[in-house]
Amino acid sequence: KFSKQSWGLENEALIVRCPRQGKPSYTVDWYYSQTNKSIPTQERNRVFASGQLLKFLPAAVADSGIYTCIVRSPTFNRTGYANVTIYKKQSDCNVPDYLMYSTVSGSEKNSKIYCPTIDLYNWTAPLEWFKNCQALQGSRYRAHKSFLVIDNVMTEDAGDYTCKFIHNENGANYSVTATRSFTVKDEQGFSLFPVIGAPAQNEIKEVEIGKNANLTCSACFGKGTQFLAAVLWQLNGTKITDFGEPRIQQEEGQNQSFSNGLACLDMVLRIADVKEEDLLLQYDCLALNLHGLRRHTVRLSRKNPSKECF
């Protein structure tokens, strides 16, 4: 069942997106689930539908309930449900758990706190940010686009952060607040000279002529967030893009973080329709970062067709 929880505070704007996605050209109809009554699209209404979005301008406690959205295309209909809860404003500073968005964690190198759901709204900078209800002041805090950056993060920076912004709809302004917890990871990240896990040095890879082949270059660079780390393939000492053979392409694999915390990168070299001349090339897996560069070389060899038993 495609259902999504949404929540907001009374007298604030709340915009909810249909959990079922479709092309912008598809029509989306919204209904009150209990009554099956259609939600109007006219903007003069306090609650109205606008394509994939359901807008409460502003929200009231009585708006709480389940809303149905149906995405209609020429060939299919998709149904989703938005479970909306509107809460009364708290008189004290504490933000209850049910109003909290997902917790984010940061470290000395990476301390961005994104304002939750803000991309649904028509807002203009700057955002206002609060920590435990206190407005954030000082040069360490920088409101940038839709996120807060904290310089020189310390363990004391952990806490509940609230972003406040104004949504504008046809000239009318509505306030929106959203809160999430921020935790500080006490991780001492470090960077190492690259270590290539695959391929092995001077590896011979067996391939079949006419078939496709994949080579994976995988390397680790240290622990935590890595600055300027990359893996790539070269052919005969030339970058893939400069080599000019459209059959041979590289694409980024997964950024990996293993259970031991090592930060690793993959790059897959895809060779379509392997040809004889591919066996003459030297394939270099390069891993590089600020410390230096390491190279492992692979060559291809022809795989003998498997002899079938009759």
Epitope: G237, L288, G292, R295
Partner: nanobody, 118 residues
Framework: ESGGGSVQAGGSLRLSCAAS????????MGWFRQAPGKEREGVAA????????YYADSVKGRFTISQDNAKNTVYLQMNSLKPEDTAMYYC????????????????WGQGTQVTVSS
Amino acid sequence: ESGGGSVQAGGSLRLSCAASGYTYSGICMGWFRQAPGKEREGVAAIYTNGEYTYYADSVKGRFTISQDNAKNTVYLQMNSLKPEDTAMYYCAADRNTCGLRGDFYNYWGQGTQVTVSS
């Protein structure tokens, strides 16, 4: 290696180092230096076509490493020289690693002396 010598502070020198026996397939060449009574330190390194270069913080902005693939030669242009740049400069080469750590290099030159007086 060649190009070493004596120079006044603020002057320039250009060191060169030729490697033989390497093909198109990629080589890293680096410059290292060792002053009397001090440990060897990496100065600069370059991989094949100069796309990847590494410099020690102490020489950034003053030294430039470059390569002539056709001649398999690496150059170190040293500008704004300081007395603390005085050392024996060694050229090193390796096929599979590049950077400022000397223990990764398999091939070493004999060295050329650079002396900078104030």
